[in-house]
């Protein structure tokens, strides 16, 4: 999916008004210096698609946080400000059921919650520049 | 500049068909859910379908669900509404719209100019 | 199906005054994850509609600062902080939480 076309001032503040406290929740009792970030991101489409990445592509590692209540957040968000990238509106009831069968976090999933903050802080800090 | 042009509009006599077309322009069709909604004579708005961007989800009022049936071609940027059983109650100006699914939580940002159907004998 | 009430019916306003619209639906709009899927029209005279506001408080491209929306849940308004002669015209609401999307009645605000 190509990002270019999404409002991203208001994805912005979605993300600081829910979807960066539901990542903060996920982390807690964790320090942001337990993890190196290593993933990053050079401009507000392209640190999209990595978040997207991050957020829903499974990895052998970490195979559940699309079931996560950030990830469902974040895709409503996307599909909310982004033309034509979910054709129908996210609903939070079966994410919520969905959330609550599986509780088990995985220090590597931790981990990609970490990379998930910082390319979040990018993508705000290239709308700050671009203002 | 952002453009939705209604053609097909007319008279038609009860129980008669039509088919209504919208050609889009200025924008990618593709991203973009659509809706018709249409306006009898001094009366209110009235929603009729919305098709989502990819054709997956497709919706009708029941004043015209089994009568009317909405499409679309992406790759010609145009949007139809085909009108069968026609009823005097049908009689309206009706209106191609952008919008009605997930983006901007389905307002209609787009408006065309309008058709007339006019269902009489 | 959602019923939109709209209040008044018609509304006749000097230029300069403020001017509210009220729109009630028969159940929440809320959805799950925070936004209300309530929208504003404007039909002006011989014209297409025009989309106003969107989600309940968000300006539409190229309205004016002077038309805003609020409210919550079930009741919502339209405020115009000073009405211009241009803004003539009946005003819709909208829900599109489920289908059957369903429109207000429509209030025409007219000029004194």
């Known amino acids: 999916y190509d990002f270019t076309n999404c409002d991203f001032q208001k994805i912005e503040a979605d993300y600081l008004r829910t979807i960066s406290k539901d990542l903060i929740t996920y982390m807690s009792g964790t320090k942001s210096t337990d993890f190196n970030n290593t993933v990053s991101c050079s401009n507000r489409p392209h640190c999209l698609t990595e978040i997207q990445s991050l957020t829903f592509n499974p990895t052998p590692r970490c195979a559940s946080l699309a079931k996560e209540m950030f990830a469902r957040k974040t895709k409503a968000t996307l599909a909310l400000w982004c033309p034509g990238y979910s054709e129908t509106q996210i609903n939070a009831t079966q994410a919520m059921k969905k959330a609550r069968k599986s509780k088990v976090t995985t220090n590597k999933c931790l981990e990609q919650v970490s990379q998930l903050l910082g390319l979040w802080r990018r993508f705000i800090r290239t709308l700050l520049k671009k203002q | 500049e952002v453009q939705l042009v209604e053609s097909g509009g007319g008279l038609v006599q009860p129980g008669g068909s039509l088919r209504l077309s919208c050609a889009a322009s200025g924008f990618t069709f593709s991203n973009y859910g659509m809706t018709w909604v249409r306006q009898a004579p001094g009366k209110g708005l009235e929603w009729v379908s919305s098709?989502?961007?990819?054709?997956?989800?497709?919706y009708y009022a029941d004043s015209v669900k089994g009568r009317f049936t909405i499409s679309r071609d992406n790759a010609k940027n145009s949007l139809s509404l085909q009108m069968n059983s026609l009823r005097a109650e049908d009689t309206a100006v009706y209106y191609c719209?952008?919008?009605?699914?997930?983006?901007?939580?389905?307002?209609?940002?787009?408006w065309g100019q309008g058709v007339l159907v006019t269902v009489s004998s | 199906d959602i019923v939109m009430t709209q209040t008044p019916l018609s509304l006749s306003v000097t230029p300069g005054e403020p001017a509210s619209i009220s729109c009630r639906s028969s159940q929440s709009l809320l959805h799950s994850y925070g936004y209300t899927y309530l929208h504003w029209y404007l039909q002006k005279p011989g014209q297409s509609p025009q989309l106003l506001i969107y989600l309940v408080s968000y300006r539409a491209s190229g309205v004016p600062d002077r038309f805003s929306g609020s409210g919550s849940d079930t009741d919502f308004t339209l405020k115009i902080s000073r009405v211009e002669a241009e803004d003539v015209g009946v005003y819709y609401c909208e829900q599109t939480l489920q289908t059957p999307y369903t429109f207000g009645g429509g209030t025409k605000v007219e000029i004194k």
């Open positions: 719209t952008r919008g009605g699914g997930a983006y901007y939580g389905g307002s209609l940002d787009v």
């Open positions: 098709i989502t961007f990819a054709s997956s989800y497709i």
